[in-house]
Interface confidence: medium
């Protein structure tokens, strides 16, 4: 329904609070190199400005659309050329195509200084000092460094961020007490971050179809006892909820997700048994539980797959009748039925069953030509099946660390020229599908491993578009959306590549390791053996480990010493020099 | 939730025509499809022909066809059987059914919502 004022409508909607906190996040997702300051006053102007809009809807410029408004608004930042360069140019294009020009320049990899956490005590005085401001910070930092996080749920973050705070800094032991809850909430944010890109991405590259059918296959598992009509609905309504939010409409995907949790919770005896916690809970709380809640039980009597979909002779009929329809509900049935699938393997049997009709739908016999179908789904399903058995038995035996440590190795093979700092991220991402996954029984492995490493990859593919250096990576991440994880997974060592020359340099290290946390510790070992690796890509497994065995004792022993700078420089030297003998280079 | 109450049933001679209609109301959809059933007395439910709602393509069971046509009003949200050349074995409870979706169905299973029915009965 149209409304005089856009930017009045969604003020009233989401009321001043949250108006300004999703304002904030769209500006600094935009323009993620401007100071908090000076977002700040942007964000000021824009809020004052919409009470005028409520006020008076026929008021001059109430009546523009929400990207003219915010737009024009970016443009007034005075330093727009220097800091940004040739993003100033999508200020002389016109609506919608400046938003575009806007989305085109958002960065991933922002040149940014790491967050670096303030002691308790100084973190606490600020929140009590000025506890808006603090919570503003938060949304910006987040923001900026995450251009794509899911505004709506970035508002719930800020919510147990502040929380937090609110309940910590009263506490006996504030540290003890706050420290556990930021860790969570950093590991939690940068995993909601990762899996809103693979929407985004999905959206953006593969466009609404795949979104769309990803859509179909989740909520049809977690909804299984849903009508078709009723998984389709929602599913219309979530692709425009993150079209929006992808798009940098904020505001009006923060309210259309609010009407959909609304309309869930108001129909939850025709979606789903396990919503009622969810929808008992406030507006923010209620959204991210209805996004994370349990599957459903399956219904108990649903009939074979195979009568409506290989042994009905109506099959190219209906299929013919309208094809997006008809996968769509192979789509819903297959996925009800299989919970215990990746989604992304869902989606894999729904395009070989869309192949097969295409082709049999023509042939002169198509019931004899498709009858075969569901033999194909075999070698589909067994491959996640045996991949996700062989990386759960690894890791079980080596653990996290070295688990990571062997991705590291192998991706490291398989696309020498991608940089190390992206090649260390994501191989330690993917190792963490170890702990993440392999403690699950069989009938959860596969859809919490595959759809994890989904995401994990797609950090990959959006970090490699930035500045493609390798075609392999640039195939697997363009091809298929849903063949990307078997994609890499097929990747042998690429024997094209011709092995970094040497630098000590790079394998000097100083006492400042010792004062790092472990984390950071293990960071630093593995972006050697990343090194490593590309100087001598035929380097075994065992030569590999004794070098990186003879490196950790080598730290050990020169953060032990007195004189740890002298023990760095002079073990440094033997080790380099003994870890050049053992790989011959 | 759909809501499907089928109306014009009654009492005719063979030979004579009737109009049934099938007012759907609750959800729409993007696709729907609108199946015709019969129940005889002493009989199984037996299916007499359905409509993909999109796209206005019909099919029905042989002993109907030629005889019944299926037909839609999208404005009114009603889709009607008009039933020809009625025979004494015709006589049943006939209901209307919808699914969503889209399929040539032929059986109960596939469809989700049901009408009360309306009787109709055909005397020699």
């Known amino acids: 329904d149209a409304h005089k004022s856009e930017v009045a409508h969604r003020f009233k909607d989401l009321g001043e609070e949250n108006f300004k906190a999703l304002v904030l996040i769209a500006f600094a997702q935009y323009l993620q190199q401007c100071p908090f300051e000076d977002h700040v006053k942007l964000v000021n102007e824009v809020t004052e400005f919409a009470k005028t809009c409520v006020a008076d809807e026929s008021a001059e410029n109430c009546d523009k659309s929400l990207h003219t408004l915010f737009g024009d608004k970016l443009c007034t930042v005075a330093t727009l050329r220097e800091t940004y360069g040739e993003m100033a140019d999508c200020c002389a294009k016109q609506e919608p195509e400046r938003n575009e020009c806007f989305l085109q320049h958002k960065d991933d990899n922002p040149n940014l200084p790491r967050l670096v956490r303030p002691e308790v005590d100084v973190m606490c005085t600020a929140f009590h000092d000025n506890e808006e401001t603090f919570l503003k910070k938060y949304l910006y930092e987040i923001a900026r460094r995450h251009p794509y996080f899911y505004a709506p749920e970035l508002l719930f973050f800020a919510k147990r961020y502040k929380a937090a705070f609110t309940e910590c800094c009263q506490a006996a032991d504030k540290a003890a007490c706050l420290l556990p809850k930021l860790d969570e909430l950093r590991d939690e944010g940068k995993a909601s971050s990762a899996k809103q890109r693979l929407k985004c991405a999905s959206l953006q590259k593969f466009g609404e179809r795949a979104f769309k059918a990803w859509a179909v296959a989740r909520l049809s598992q977690r909804f299984p006892k849903a009508e078709f009509a009723e998984v389709s609905k929602l599913v219309t309504d979530l692709t425009k909820v993150h079209t929006e939010c992808c798009h940098g409409d904020l505001l009006e995907c923060a309210d259309d997700r609010a009407d959909l949790a609304k309309y869930i919770c108001e129909n939850q005896d025709s979606i789903s048994s396990k919503l009622k916690e969810c929808c008992e809970k406030p507006l923010l709380e209620k959204s991210h539980c209805i996004a994370e809640v349990e599957n459903d039980e399956m219904p108990a009597d649903l009939p074979s797959l195979a009568a409506d979909f290989v042994e009905s002779k109506d099959v190219c009929k209906n299929y013919a009748e309208a094809k997006d329809v008809f996968l769509g509900m192979f789509l819903y049935e297959y996925a009800r039925r299989h919970p215990d699938y990746s989604v992304v393997l869902l989606l894999r049997l729904a395009k070989t069953y869309e192949t097969t009709l295409e082709k049999c739908c023509a042939a002169a016999d198509p019931h004899e030509c498709y009858a075969k179908v569901f033999d194909e789904f075999k070698p589909l399903v067994e491959e996640p099946q045996n991949l996700i058995k062989q990386n759960c038995e690894l890791f079980e035996q080596l653990g996290e660390y070295k688990f990571q440590n062997a991705l590291l190795v192998r991706y490291t093979k398989k696309v020498p020229q991608v940089s190390t700092p992206t090649l260390v991220e994501v191989s330690r991402n993917l190792g963490k599908v170890g702990s993440k996954c392999c403690k699950h029984p069989e009938a959860k492995r596969m859809p919490c491993a595959e759809d994890y490493l989904s995401v994990v990859l797609n950090q990959l593919c959006v970090l490699h578009e930035k500045t493609p250096v390798s075609d392999r990576v640039t195939k697997c991440c363009t091809e298929s959306l849903v063949n990307r994880r078997p994609c890499f997974s097929a990747l042998e060592v690429d024997e094209t590549y011709v092995p970094k020359e040497f630098n000590a340099e790079t394998f000097t290290f100083h006492a400042d390791i010792c004062t790092l946390s472990e984390k950071e510790r293990q960071i630093k070992k593995q972006t050697a053996l990343v090194e490593l690796v590309k100087h001598k890509p035929k380097a075994t497994k065992e030569q590999l480990k004794a070098v990186m065995d003879d490196f950790a004792a080598f730290v050990e022993k020169c953060c032990k010493a007195d004189d740890k700078e002298t023990c760095f420089a002079e073990e440094g030297k033997k080790l380099v020099a003994a870890s050049q003998a053992a790989l011959g280079l | 939730e759909v809501q499907l109450v089928e109306s014009g049933g009654g009492l005719v001679q063979a030979g004579d025509s009737l109009r049934l209609s099938c007012a759907a109301s609750g959800r729409p959809f993007m696709s729907y499809v609108m199946g015709w059933f019969r129940r005889a007395p002493g009989k199984e439910r037996e299916f007499v022909g359905g409509?993909?709602?999109?796209?206005?393509?019909?099919w029905y069971t042989d002993s109907v066809l030629g005889r019944f046509t299926i037909s839609r009003d999208n404005a009114k949200n009603t889709v009607y059987l008009q039933m020809n050349s009625l025979k004494p074995e015709d006589t049943a409870v006939y209901y209307c059914?919808?699914?969503?979706?889209?399929?040539?169905?032929?059986?109960?299973?596939?469809?989700?919502?049901w009408g009360q029915g309306t009787q109709v009965t055909v005397s020699s």
């Open positions: 059914a919808t699914a969503a979706g889209v399929g040539y169905y032929r059986y109960e299973r596939q469809y989700d919502y």
């Open positions: 409509i993909n709602w999109g796209s206005g393509n019909t």
